[in-house]
């Protein structure tokens, strides 16, 4: 599999959508998992509702969502309050029993907010966290990883 | 919080119409599916019905297929539930709950339909 | 659709008494079962989801186990904010469907 990055702004909101055969994977639930160093295993971070027929419905996990169109074949995760230590490797799957079928390959970047700069009293911090939806646009930059590149790095 | 405050029970003929609301607060309403869900006096609960995040999906139990519609207005924070053509065994306590983590994390306290001539 | 079959109907205990409940599919629902409490004039609550896993802000006195077909919810030991009515869900086969409800009540 490629790896496509995704690359979000910390403090907003990440969208990252993994297309599939939607016959192929017919009857099947998904999920997200993020790869554990370079060899690791992919631990489940969330995964779409038990009930296949309702994949539509937006699951969450702290500040992950998971949504399914199963007709269209379209996985989409949402990373909501973008921080940095999101950033790293992570697997759309398709599963089936025991097992999962990798849709994609994901690499999450976390740029800088670019509000960073200015001083604390200029920021504006909403009252919760699930506010922040409302206060930035999700948006996101994705690409493939060009070949030769690695999405860890080199261990020493 | 999360906050779920269903309204617009009441007593109504059979044959006629009602119209349900559920005004949600401390949590973003629009990234969330939602569901109602009814309890006959006496009785057990029952799936009646869900929403997707955006309103672009709609399923029904059968029971009210065909005569109960569920919307949102994500703007105004709140769901619906029109019923119509309505009959005794409608009679119920309609509770509004949403869908999160699972598939139902949290409930309203409910509003009650009683259908009588 | 899937019946779910609760049982008993009323369980009599008194505070500090261990409380085992039923819950029967009429087919697999494999470990996609849930657990609510109810208590009079208010809305459910969620308590267990995926057959024994606590939702957030439940005590460990309450538990839940089992697969397939039968499950069960055991409260450890009873306190008095316990006594209510307790109903299982599965979300195994579309629609979701609840069981009748096992009302526990102090004795």
């Known amino acids: 599999h490629n790896t496509t990055v995704f690359q979000g702004v910390a403090g907003q909101s990440l969208q990252v959508s993994c297309p599939y055969d939607s016959m192929k994977h017919w009857g099947r639930r998904k999920a997200w998992c993020r790869q554990l160093g370079e060899k690791g295993p992919c631990q489940r971070v969330v995964s779409t509702h038990n009930l296949w027929l309702l994949s539509f419905l937006r699951r969450w996990n702290g500040s992950t969502a998971i949504t399914d169109d199963t007709l269209g074949g379209t996985l989409t995760i949402t990373l909501r309050n973008l921080q940095p230590h999101d950033a790293g490797l992570y697997q759309c799957q398709s599963l089936h029993g025991s097992e999962a079928d990798t849709l994609r390959k994901v690499l999450v970047e976390v740029l800088a907010d670019p509000l960073d700069h200015r001083d604390a009293g200029d920021l504006w911090f909403p009252g919760e966290s699930e506010s922040f939806e409302d206060a930035h646009v999700e948006h996101s930059i994705s690409r493939s990883l060009l070949e030769g590149e690695i999405p860890f790095p080199p261990t020493s | 919080q999360v906050q779920l405050v269903e309204s617009g029970g009441g007593v109504v003929q059979p044959g006629r119409s009602l119209r349900l609301s559920c005004a949600a607060s401390g949590f973003t309403f629009s990234s969330y599916g939602m569901h109602w869900v009814r309890q006959a006096p006496g009785k057990g609960l029952e799936w009646v019905a869900v929403i997707s995040y955006d309103g672009s999906n709609k399923y029904y139990a059968d029971s009210v297929k065909g005569r109960f519609t569920i919307s949102r207005d994500n703007s105004k924070n709140t769901l619906y539930l029109q019923m119509n053509s309505l009959r005794a065994e409608d009679t119920a306590v309609y509770y509004c709950a949403r869908a999160g983590g699972h598939l139902f994390d949290y409930w309203g306290q409910g509003t009650l339909v009683t259908v009588s001539s | 659709e899937i019946v779910l079959t609760q049982s008993p109907a009323t369980l009599s205990l008194s505070p500090g008494e261990r409380a085992t409940l039923s819950c029967r599919a009429s087919?697999?629902?494999?470990?996609?079962l849930a657990w609510y409490q109810q208590k009079p004039g208010q809305a459910p609550r969620l308590l267990i989801y995926?057959?024994?896993n606590r939702a957030t802000g439940i005590p460990a006195r309450f538990s839940g186990s089992g697969s397939g077909t039968d499950f069960t919810l055991t409260i450890s030991s009873l306190e008095p904010e316990d006594f209510a009515v307790y109903y299982c869900q599965q979300d195994s086969s579309f629609p979701p469907t609840f069981g009748g409800g096992t009302k526990v009540e102090i004795k």
């Open positions: 087919q697999s629902v494999s470990s996609y």
């Open positions: 995926d057959a024994s």
